[in-house]
Amino acid sequence: YSTSHPCFVSRPCLNGGTCHMLSRDTYECTCQVGFTGKECQWTDACLSHPCANGSTCTTVANQFSCKCLTGFTGQKCETDVNECDIPGHCQHGGTCLNLPGSYQCQCPQGFTGQYCDSLYVPCAPSPCVNGGTCRQTGDFTFECNCLPGFEGSTCERNIDDCPNHRCQNGGVCVDGVNTYNCRCPPQWTGQFCTEDVDECLLQPNACQNGGTCANRNGGYGCVCVNGWSGDDCSE
């Protein structure tokens, strides 16, 4: 049916679009960049990315249409909705602060929550992270007792242990939680790179031509025989 198919008879895909036969009399056009529509008949108005603030662009009859995210308005979703123009967002005397696409309530002492609708209890829930323990120090104040290795008002920071590191034999410090580890060069191992790697065990054929391998701190050597020489008795 190929010669009588619309793809060949009417050549429906415009502006350089490619026609794909789906069945005896149906087709689908793959449009060139910059064109859209069933038959690639429309210029793709979305190509210039006219829709702002994360909105979704669709093309209809050479025109673009933007579907805005909550908190934005306008033909191109370019205008931030000022939620604070509508009273009553923030309760208990909270101050409304407009933000791009949203708003935030700054609550008076004693209240918390998105709308300042909850009573504030310093340690319920605990603001202390990383295993820190919350202790109420007043009606509206608290302090966090941090586990070793953490600091900050809510124990949010892992203390960098590398400034005081003791990585030996060319080891490079990698910070951990209240400790550090050392990334060792190939000849050394152990948490602090203090353990010598026995290259003679790792490489049984390190020495050629009957040479004997002798492990040393940070390396190895070959004791050559029968006139052989060189680092690995190969010369």
Epitope: H165, R166, Q168, G170
Partner: antibody
């Protein structure tokens, strides 16, 4: 044979300065951490300052009691470690030892020590 | 800073006695502990590193043990030349810290 020999100690007035030297031999100087440790008469050992090795960019650490007053440095061409001591206090009076950190988290070689006396 | 608590501060013993010195650290030092011997007017001498490893040339009557925060130096049979002051030292991180010392005296 590993050897460390300190020099430069002596009597100095409070607020004065002194520079200690530690000449080393018998090992590749730049491969090792080097430390200064002091000992007041009849007291225990107190770590003063350290300079890490070439692999650790010769980075430096000081004890809180000498920070901003003492400066550790080294001259690899002379295989010598230094301790420049400024704004000296009477409590800095001690025998100062230079030591090598032997790659095992321990100080495996020590100099004979040099006495620094801070007194008016 | 890591605190080092060494005990006892002194011990009286006789030749042939077994002597034990302990060192406790304020946090885990991952076996990064060394023991030194110091005689009057002399520099300290390394005996044990890595909590339990004997430094070259040190007699086998000296031994070290421990992990985490608790470490021990043992002299199995005290010899006349062992009368000295002994220090522990953590090498886990700067600032390096030493124990207060243990003086081993003749009974």
């Amino acid at each position: 044979e590993v050897q460390l020999v300190e020099s430069g100690g002596g009597l100095v007035q409070p607020g004065g300065s002194l520079k200690l030297s530690c000449a080393v031999s018998g090992f590749t100087f730049s491969d090792f951490y080097m430390e200064w440790v002091r000992q007041a008469s009849g007291k225990g050992l107190e770590w003063v300052a350290a300079q890490r090795n070439k692999a650790n960019d010769f980075s430096i650490v000081y004890s809180a009691s000498v920070k901003d007053r003492f400066t550790i440095s080294r001259d690899d061409s002379k295989s010598t470690l230094y301790l420049q001591m400024n704004s000296l206090k009477t409590e800095d009076t001690a025998v100062y030892y230079c030591s090598r950190d032997g790659g095992r988290l321990a100080l495996d070689a020590w100099g004979q020590g040099t006495l620094v006396t801070v007194s008016s | 800073d890591i605190q080092m608590t060494q005990s006892p501060s002194s011990v009286s013993a006789s030749v042939g006695d077994r002597v034990t010195i302990t060192c406790q650290t304020s946090e885990d030092i991952y076996s990064g502990l060394a023991w030194y011997q110091q005689k009057p007017g002399k520099s300290p001498k390394l005996l044990i590193y890595g909590a339990s490893r004997l430094q070259d040339g040190v007699p086998s009557r000296f031994s070290g043990s421990g992990s985490g925060t608790d470490y021990t130096l043992t002299i199995s049979s005290l010899q006349p030349e062992d009368f000295a002051t002994y220090y522990c030292q953590q090498g886990f991180k700067y600032p390096l810290t030493f124990g207060g010392g243990t003086k081993v005296e003749i009974k």
